[in-house]
């Protein structure tokens, strides 16, 4: 998985004689918004083949009202880049369409009118993860420089994105024949040679065609926990060294779609089922017709002459999704729950919980207090709909399991001294403070101003 | 015992709209996505849709999309089937069918058939 | 969609025959397949998940084999209660497609 992203720098007049002074007609201003479909291959494809690899639309750009007599501007664009997600690997020969619109906004009958301005067909090759591409492409009469590359998402890396990283077994090194893997120094590079299906999690290999389980996990593709209750609580982001790798927090915390998307976890990125009449990566792109072209993967627009009425996308087979975006795959049905991810192994579905969920479909909630141990005397303490463990003096961590110096908290105020003690802490307070945690100030007449019953 | 049960046989008008129920039993409703097959007199098997019980989302064959609506009661443990505008080509027999939400297994179990008969 | 071609459409055979149907999908699609038996007026019963998986309570004379995009279904002693329409289906991809049935028919 990974983000193809493609940045517009200037749109206008080519150098030659009679080249056109404004994208705008003479009935007044006009903006400009841009098209990108990216198709798999280096074949001539028909110019209606549909953007297989995916396609994005830019938000519209500001006005621009042609001056008589003046120079001819820079053009005005839209703002930021153009972001094509890809689910698969990237295949590193593709076509290249960038189609410039303009939307005159005069006094058009039934509100804005949209035409295609330029069109321009590239094949190219391109490595995922190197460096932005810049190209100059001329349309007619028009002029489009613009930059271009494919970045993996991570735990993808490599030329195709289809290596995996992972944690490093040890601090100091990766595996025999492993290099780091940029830019993550940290990690290591997964051997891309384990069983078909082996967990990328749980499992790991030193051997072709091996799949061997880390602690607490097992079956021949590493992905049958021995036992929950040894995970419970060891669910931060990093809980490796115990085997369970329960991943933290997940990319659809906080939920990135705008305009009333929904957030579903993709292998790591995240995927907006947008709302009719909004697309882009986060639902972003509004007041889309059909004249813009929002149905991909040859879908049939109907309706929407006008941003304010809606248009509706006829899917062809096997594809679905307000923009007809999103392929229909046997993980479409959303089987895991609770935000978990849908692994399709070939000869079954499978479920990558997120943290504080377990179960085949991610169904059980560790994280409550029926299930959740509280060790060294802690109590486990519910509200919010969160649940944590309340520890003991001289405990602490997410179970109360680690010692924790009562101290540690600079717990005495106004300076008072604090001393570990076998029944928990003693502050010994300042001249002038009194009180359990030296909190009350002493009054020269010996009165402390301690708070009203 | 897993069972499905299905409602009764349905005579009906051109035009008119037919609502087919499959009542689960015996498992856990929402573990299980449920399928839909048509047989028309003397034919074939033919996949209609499918729906996963626990969230709603429903996935349909392109020849069943638009007059056909799929849709659960959770409650009751119990999937329907609703076809609108009906045709005479709608006659035939209406199964559910349950498989496994992780498609470890196939179509398992099966609800005895309902016979929708179209005719004026 | 994917195309389920199953030979033979009919067959005929007596009982303790050994009978075999096949199953082609139009690509490969990796043992997400089953078997089905459906008699006269009755609903259809699974036989054979994942192209080789008995299905609870099914007798050990029905047996599933193959790869790719070729499966077969051996009954290895047809027995009378045996004889039916049978149909081999596809869940590799949506949408699921059967394929056109057998008639198993008395010798």
């Known amino acids: 998985a990974g983000v193809f992203e493609l940045q517009i720098h200037s749109f206008g007049p080519g150098p030659g004689p009679g080249a056109p002074r404004s994208p705008c007609s003479a009935r007044g201003p006009c903006r400009l918004f841009f098209r990108v479909c990216l198709k798999p291959g280096l074949s001539e494809e028909a110019a209606e083949s549909p953007c297989a690899l995916g396609a994005a639309l830019s938000a519209r750009g500001p006005v621009y009202t042609e001056q008589p007599e003046a120079p001819a501007p820079d053009l005005p664009l839209p703002n930021g880049l153009l972001q094509v997600p890809f689910r698969d690997a990237w295949p590193g020969t593709f076509s290249l369409i960038i189609e410039t619109w303009r939307e005159e906004l005069g006094d058009q009958i039934g509100g804005p009118a949209w035409s295609l301005l330029a069109r321009v067909t590239r094949r190219r090759r391109l490595a995922a993860g190197g460096p932005w591409a810049r190209d100059i492409q001329r349309a007619g009469a028009w002029e489009l420089r613009f930059s271009y590359r494919a970045r993996c998402e991570l735990p993808a890396v490599g030329t195709a994105c289809t290596r995996l990283c992972r944690p490093r077994s040890a601090p100091s090194r990766c595996g025999p024949g492993l290099r780091p893997c940029a830019p993550l120094e940290d990690e290591c590079e997964a051997p891309p040679v384990c069983r078909a299906g082996c967990s990328l999690e749980h499992g790991f290999c030193e051997q072709p065609g091996e799949c061997r389980c880390l602690e607490g996990w097992t079956g021949p593709l590493c992905m049958v926990p021995v036992s929950t209750s040894s995970c419970l609580g060891l669910r931060g982001p990093s809980s490796t060294t115990t085997g369970c790798l329960v991943p933290g927090p997940g990319p659809c915390d906080g939920n990135p779609c705008a305009n009333g998307g929904s957030c579903s976890e993709t292998p790591g990125s995240f995927e907006c089922t947008c709302p009719r009449g909004f697309y882009g990566l986060r639902c972003e792109v509004s007041g889309v017709t059909c004249a813009d072209g929002p149905c991909f993967n040859g879908g049939l627009c109907v309706g929407g002459a006008d941003p304010d009425s809606a248009y509706i996308c006829h899917c062809p087979p096997g594809f679905q999704g307000s923009n007809c975006e999103k392929r229909v795959d046997r993980c479409s049905l959303q089987p895991c729950r609770n935000g978990g991810l849908c692994l399709d192994l070939g000869h079954a579905l499978r479920c990558r919980c997120r943290a504080g969920f377990a179960g085949p479909r991610c169904e059980h909630d560790l994280d409550d207090c029926a299930g959740r141990a509280c060790a060294n005397g802690g109590t486990c303490v519910e509200g919010g709909g969160a649940h944590r463990c309340s520890c003991a003096l001289g405990f602490g961590g997410r179970n109360c399991r680690e010692r924790a110096d009562p101290c540690a908290a600079r717990p005495c105020a106004h300076g008072g001294r604090c001393y570990a003690h076998f029944s928990g802490l003693v502050c010994a307070c300042a001249p002038g403070y009194m009180g359990a945690r030296c909190e009350f100030p002493v009054h020269p007449d010996g009165v402390s101003a301690l708070p009203a019953a | 015992e897993v069972q499905l049960v299905q409602s009764g046989s349905e005579l009906k008008k051109p035009g008119a709209s037919v609502k087919v129920s499959c009542k689960a039993s015996?498992?856990?409703?929402?573990?299980?996505?449920m399928n839909w097959v048509r047989q028309a007199p003397g034919q074939g098997l033919e996949w209609m849709g499918i729906i996963n019980p626990y969230s709603g989302v429903t996935i349909y064959n392109h020849k069943f999309k638009g007059r056909f609506a799929l849709s659960v009661d959770k409650s009751s443990n119990t999937a329907y089937l609703q076809i609108s505008s009906l045709k005479a080509e709608d006659t035939a027999v209406y199964y559910c069918a349950r498989q496994d939400s992780l498609l470890d297994y196939a179509m398992d179990y099966w609800g005895q058939g309902t016979t929708v008969t179209v005719s004026s | 969609d994917i195309q389920m071609t199953q030979s033979p459409s009919s067959l005929s055979a007596s009982v303790g025959d050994r009978v075999t149907i096949t199953c082609h999908a139009s690509?490969?699609?990796?043992?997400?397949m089953g078997w089905l038996q459906q008699k006269p007026g009755k609903a259809p019963k699974g036989l054979i998940y994942h192209g080789a998986n008995l299905e609870d309570g099914v007798p050990s004379r029905f047996s599933g084999s193959g790869s790719g995009a070729d499966y077969t279904l051996t009954i290895s002693s047809l027995q009378p209660e045996d004889f039916a329409d049978y149909y081999c289906?596809?869940?590799?991809?949506?949408?699921?497609?059967f394929g056109g049935g057998t008639k198993v028919e008395i010798k």
């Open positions: 289906v596809q869940y590799a991809q949506f949408p699921y497609t």
């Open positions: 015996g498992y856990t409703f929402t573990d299980y996505y």
């Open positions: 690509q490969g699609i990796s043992g997400n």
